[in-house]
Amino acid sequence: EKLPKAPVITTPLETVDALVEEVATFMCAVESYPQPEISWTRNKILIKLFDTRYSIRENGQLLTILSVEDSDDGIYCCIANNGVGGAVESCGALQVKMKPKITRPPINVKIIEGLKAVLPCTTMGNPKPSVSWIKGDNALRENSRIAVLESGSLRIHNVQKEDAGQYRCVAKNSLGTAYSKLVKLEVEVFARILRAPESHNVTFGSFVTLRCTAIGIPVPTISWIENGNAVSSGSIQESVKDRVIDSRLQLFITKPGLYTCIATNKHGEKFSTAKAAATVSIAEWSKSQKDSQGYCAQYRGEVCDAVLAKDALVFFNTSYRDPEDAQELLIHTAWNELKAVSPLCRPAAEALLCNHLFQECSPGVVPTPMPICREYCLAVKELFCAKEWQAMEGKAHRGLYRSGMHLLPVPECSKLPSMHRDPTACTRLPYLDYKKENITTFPSITSSRPSADIPNLPASTSSFAVSPAYSMT
């Protein structure tokens, strides 16, 4: 009969290296009598015999982990006890070796130029994988802006347009290499105007093209504003090439305007906007490209019918595509503006404008317009419409206005010929000869300080006294 013998572990446990999903075995050979009970612990926690992840054989001397998981690493101990003497224990470590695995791969990123971008790449593996990045087909080099963090993430400071592209991270250890899917870094750029529209000074009825070029990512949209309102007239043509949008606004100019080009693009829920403005002003119509060339015809319009002399030939300026329509449209626009002026000023201004836009045809070999006599122009400016004219000139340097006389095609009185020099070289305004009650009923005008610029108006069959300087008698 054998003598009782306390357990002795003849093969101490060793460190076991195992790959994930592979089999790992610990052997705990024990000599003893009677036969010992062998139990196993992992990190001091008893492994239950019925745990199907383990197989315990050879009377408990062999522990097999059937499919190693990364969470199985730790200290495994076998404890043998047969009641003779004390229990004995031997321990060994399980090191789960793991091919690289990317646990948090990078994702597509949209980032605004100049900001910081971080592309994540969290990995697992044993040994710990090293992480590198590929952009396009080439390994990405780190520099002062671009760094691979300890975590494996890629950080790009002050993102530039050229950083846009496809990226993937690479995790590598002695057991293998893992690649993330390709992700896209899109660099968004705030809308910026490359070419602002140019201001123009044109004749009434001209066609003008305003051009505005903008860049941005995504490609901006361009809208146009005319005097604060969305453009209603004209047509817009757009083309896009290499992230640059070129917008051309075609206009038929019948009034001055402030035109604003607005380039907008969207970044997530936010928008970026860039603006540029240009003015289109109307040159005094008689200073046209045709050097006052045109033809003479009877006035067939409506607006000036009551103002112009019956059956007189008036000058139509062929620098306009359709002179009669263009000049009528201009006077129509002017007429609406006159609604804002005083009852004293309005009829005088109407007479001035009609005779300025539809000048009497000067007889001669080549048709030329006969301008208004300076004295009559000045009478309207300094008598009938003194208040309005002053307001207009006071604000002239401030650009565009919405009411009164500022948008009207008024002549420059000082540039008109004087009737005293050549009475046949200029046109009189019948209104000033006929409507004396318009002046005499306004005492404030008759006492106004006479202008040194205004010589006496001519004698007339229906003359009227104004003030000494304006005397028509």
């Epitope: 045709k290 050097d291 060339q293 033809y295 015809a297 062929t318 007889p363 001669g364 070999v365």
Partner: antibody, heavy 121, light 107 residues
Framework: QVQVQESGPGLVKPSQTLSLTCTVS??????????WSWIRQPPGKGLEWMGV???????YYSPSLKSRTSISRDTSKNQFSLHLSSVTPDDTAVYYC?????????????WGQGTQVTVSS | SYELTQSPSVSVALRQTAKITCGGD??????AQWYQQKPGQAPVMVLY???RRPSGIPERFSGSNSGNTATLTISGAQAEDEADYYC??????????FGGGTHLTVL
């Protein structure tokens, strides 16, 4: 409807003065906005403007012919005339009178049928 | 003096478009007139002030004038359009100038 009609000798000797008259009917030569020109066309060649008289009697001449050309008018007969001195065979041409109208940008809207003038000895 | 240049001849197929040009220094700043002349007849004005048609002239006659070229366009040329065509301008010195003329042949 205005009508213009040229008249004058068909043959002129070299070095002489060529005189042609244009009679205007259906409108006055003193009417504002009209002018009256002489234009000629050598055989097989293009048109050449020679000069103009305006409604008020003022005259303007082609720079190349200025020294030899004179245009006058007779308002009582509603006629205007061309005088071209020191003619040479190069002055052989069909001579037209025409009305220029301010209503049509001073274009020539009425032409005579033309009169053939030959300069030959 | 002011020179107006026209090509001597232009051919066009029946009912096709003919373009006759008149070149002159900055002619676009002047009013251009066009005249049609058939053999043995006096000229007839077909366009004035660059593009305006006198009454009685068919709509197929149109014109344009910009830069250094004035153009007479006959859209859908007819056999009766075969003629010589002359351009004409007035200069600022009250001188009239004619182009050398273009003979239009309708094939």
């Amino acid at each position: 409807q205005v009508q213009v009609q040229e008249s004058g000798p068909g043959l002129v000797k070299p070095s002489q003065t060529l005189s042609l008259t244009c009679t205007v009917s259906g409108g006055s030569i003193t009417a504002r906005y009209y002018s009256w020109s002489w234009i000629r066309q050598p055989p097989g060649k293009g048109l050449e403007w020679m000069g103009v008289i305006a409604y008020d009697g003022s005259t303007y001449y082609s720079p190349s012919l200025k020294s030899r050309t004179s245009i006058s008018r007779d308002t009582s007969k509603n006629q205007f005339s061309l005088h071209l001195s020191s003619v040479t065979p190069d002055d052989t041409a069909v001579y037209y009178c025409a009305r220029g109208s301010s209503r049509v940008a001073a274009a020539f809207d009425s032409w005579g049928q033309g009169t053939q003038v030959t300069v030959s000895s | 003096s002011y020179e107006l240049t026209q090509s001597p001849s232009v051919s066009v197929a029946l009912r096709q478009t003919a373009k006759i040009t008149c070149g002159g220094d900055n002619i676009g700043s002047k009013n251009a007139q066009w005249y049609q002349q058939k053999p043995g007849q006096a000229p007839v004005m077909v366009l004035y002030a660059d593009s305006r048609r006198p009454s009685g002239i068919p709509e197929r006659f149109s014109g344009s004038n910009s830069g250094n070229t004035a153009t007479l366009t006959i859209s859908g040329a007819q056999a009766e359009d075969e003629a010589d065509y002359y351009c004409h301008v007035w200069d600022s010195s009250t001188n009239a100038w004619f182009g050398g003329g273009t003979h239009l042949t309708v094939l």
